[in-house]
């Protein structure tokens, strides 16, 4: 019986070039967390394993930092980072719990002003 629930940061927005923390929290279960996977669409971003600690996928090493906690920090954001992110908790004996976060990366206000006004 899966009694747990995942609370996430929900729908969030951040500025291009900035950073954002993706956070999930599993509650209402005594199940043992063996691993947390962070995924974006079909891509694995990072893993936090109970035995081995953190592993960041090589293609994201430059822009992804582990933590805080079981969360994930995305850095140097681009508009291409806009989309769905999933935290997947592997637990025993419950199985997998999945949380969803939607991130929208906005053009920074500086960039917008720069495009709108020409500096003489």
């Amino acid at each position: 019986m899966m009694t747990g629930t995942i609370e996430t940061t929900g729908n969030i927005s951040a500025e291009k070039g900035g950073s954002i923390i993706l956070q999930c929290h599993l509650s209402s279960t005594t199940a043992q967390v063996t691993q947390v996977n962070w995924e974006q669409q079909d891509q694995l971003l990072a893993i936090c394993n109970a035995d081995l600690g953190w592993h960041i996928s090589p293609s994201f090493k430059d822009r992804v930092a582990p933590g805080p906690g079981l969360g994930l920090t995305l850095q140097s954001l681009t508009v291409n980072d806009t989309g769905e992110y999933f935290c997947i908790y592997h637990t025993y004996p419950d199985g997998t719990y999945t949380g969803r976060i939607f991130l929208e990366v906005l053009e920074s206000s500086v960039a917008e002003h720069g495009a709108r006004f020409q500096i003489p």
Epitope: Q32, T34, N37, L44, L52, P93, G95
Partner: antibody
Framework: EVQLVESGGALVKPGGSLKLSCAAS????????MSWVRQTPEKRLEWVAT????????YYPDSVKGRFTISRDNAKNTLYLQMSSLRSEDTALYYC????????????WGQGTSVTVSS | DFQMTQTTSSLSASLGDRVTISCRSS??????LNWYQQKPDGTVKLLIY???RLHSGVPSRFSGSGSGTDYSLTISNLEREDIATYFC?????????FGGGTKLEIK
């Protein structure tokens, strides 16, 4: 090349004990969770046990809990399954497999070792 | 426990055929569905994980689809080396249960 080679299968009497081994090579054994899966004479596959990469966590279905113990020696690249209080329904071909949590699947399997429980 | 059912226990097809093998779970498994191939000599290989993702080295003629409780494995152009028994397995919740298998034979 990933290789998993099981050994230790035998004919044992009901109530008896047996220890299976699985020698791993071709990958960093200590980085992966491992599992035992068995195939019954009726050809059904059943998950038997899983152990985390460092050996800190072990998991079993109710059918073997308290009778089977999965363990590993990362220095020897070897996985074990200690089976006790064996029953006729434990008769099966026992496979060891690498359990990849990033795939949610067992990505490599050995060739199996046969266990027969009969008087 | 999640029950996995493969209603077709054996299937006969001709070389070059398109073959579909079905699997149903007793509860929603959120696409945590894997397919394994067992050759007549007992060798087991992972073909597809998470419903549709091809494992490394698996020919592209294999594909998977489905959602919720209904899943399928398709072989688009049957080759002699595909003669085997195919098992589905749910990876969502322990115990990680398997279907009963579908044995594929050549007509």
């Amino acid at each position: 090349e990933v290789q998993l080679v099981e050994s230790g299968g035998a004919l044992v009497k009901p109530g008896g004990s047996l220890k299976l081994s699985c020698a791993a090579s071709g990958f960093t054994f200590s980085n992966y969770a491992m599992s035992w899966v068995r195939q019954t004479p009726e050809k059904r596959l059943e998950w038997v046990a899983t152990i985390s990469s460092g050996g800190s966590y072990t998991y079993y279905p109710d059918s073997v809990k308290g009778r089977f113990t999965i363990s590993r020696d990362n220095a020897k690249n070897t996985l074990y399954l200690q089976m006790s209080s064996l029953r006729s329904e434990d008769t099966a071909l026992y496979y060891c497999a690498r359990w990849l949590l990033s795939l949610y699947a067992m990505d490599y399997w050995g060739q199996g070792t046969s266990v027969t429980v009969s008087s | 426990d999640f029950q996995m059912t493969q209603t077709t226990s054996s299937l006969s097809a001709s070389l070059g055929d398109r073959v579909t093998i079905s699997c149903r779970s007793s509860q929603d498994i959120s696409n945590y569905l894997n397919w394994y191939q067992q050759k007549p000599d007992g060798t087991v290989k992972l073909l597809i994980y998470r419903t549709s993702r091809l494992h490394s080295g698996v020919p592209s003629r294999f594909s998977g689809s489905g959602s919720g409780t209904d899943y399928s494995l398709t072989i688009s152009n049957l080759e002699r080396e595909d003669i085997a028994t195919y098992f589905c397995q749910q990876g969502k919740t322990p115990p990680y249960t398997f279907g009963g298998g579908t044995k594929l034979e050549i007509k």
